[in-house]
């Protein structure tokens, strides 16, 4: 299955006083998702 | 397998410092987001700190309560992440775990008291 | 800061009886994309938390199925199906979209 999930750089949308607009990208830089192989513990969601 | 260990926990008297280290093993580091957890006895869990990857220019982020005590950097080179405890309170005891927000390791403890 | 709340504290279960824990942010945890940034994590006695659920409804990987996580942008829901014995342990919701991230404030749930 294709990772529907963009890369983006989560870092770019958030601002000191401006978090209301911050994105969770973590899954994008997690542990889970760097393992390229196996079953992991984020998968890809549908 | 995907392994963190912690180590560099130990008993320091208020005011001292400390070093925490994580080294992992068992993935690509370099990209990964990793962060430092902390849970002081009997309580409930207290995020600290956060650094991006080297995509990110190697970004910080620290909880009000150690901003300006504690440093968290990394080694991609090492695959280790670190904590540097400076000016240390009693109020900083607890078990610190490092993370990835889906793998945890098992933990150091940190004990601040004279 | 994004204060979360959970409710019940305390929860005696039942093996093989349902249970729910609920959780409450005090700011919309939906962020860009319509992903919603709640986290779901359970501390077993004398271990590390473990990963339940993450962006509010997505079963981590070898988590079992009569775990579920549902909700809204401010109010969430983790269930259990049918409780057993290896589920006991502190049970915390977490959002990771502002910093501050903060974790609630965890719920015991122990065998009756």
């Known amino acids: 299955l294709a990772d529907p999930l963009d890369h983006r750089d989560a870092g770019d949308l958030w601002f000191p006083g401006e978090s209301e607009s911050f994105e969770d990208a973590h899954v994008e830089h997690s542990i889970s998702r760097s393992l390229l192989e196996g079953e992991i513990p984020f998968p890809p969601t549908s | 397998e995907v392994q963190l260990v912690e180590s560099g926990g130990g008993l320091v008297q208020p005011g001292g410092s400390l070093k925490l280290s994580c080294a992992t093993s068992g993935f690509p580091f370099s990209n990964v987001w990793m962060h430092w957890v902390r849970q002081a006895s009997g309580k409930g869990l207290e995020w600290i700190a956060h650094i991006k990857a080297k995509s990110d220019n190697y970004a910080t982020y620290y909880a009000e309560s150690v901003k300006g005590r504690f440093t968290i950097s990394r080694d991609d080179s090492k695959t280790t992440i670190y904590l540097q405890m400076n000016s240390l309170k009693t109020e900083d005891t607890a078990v610190y775990y490092c993370?990835?927000?889906?793998?945890w390791g098992q933990g150091t403890t940190v004990t601040v008291s004279s | 800061d994004t204060v979360m709340t959970q409710s019940p504290l305390s929860l005696p279960v039942t093996p093989g009886e349902p249970a729910s824990i609920s959780c409450r942010s005090s700011?919309?945890?939906?962020?860009?994309?319509?992903?919603?940034?709640l986290y779901w994590y359970l501390q077993k006695p004398g271990q590390s938390p473990q990963l339940l659920i993450y962006?509010?409804?997505n079963l981590a990987s070898g988590v079992p199925d009569r775990f579920s996580g549902s909700g809204s942008g401010t109010d969430f829901t983790l269930k259990i199906s049918r409780v057993e014995a290896e589920d006991v342990g502190v049970y915390y919701c977490a959002q990771f979209l502002r910093y501050p991230y903060t974790f609630g404030p965890g719920t015991k749930v122990e065998i009756k």
């Open positions: 700011k919309s945890l939906l962020g860009v994309r319509d992903i919603t940034s």
């Open positions: 993370t990835g927000l889906d793998y």
């Open positions: 962006r509010m409804s």
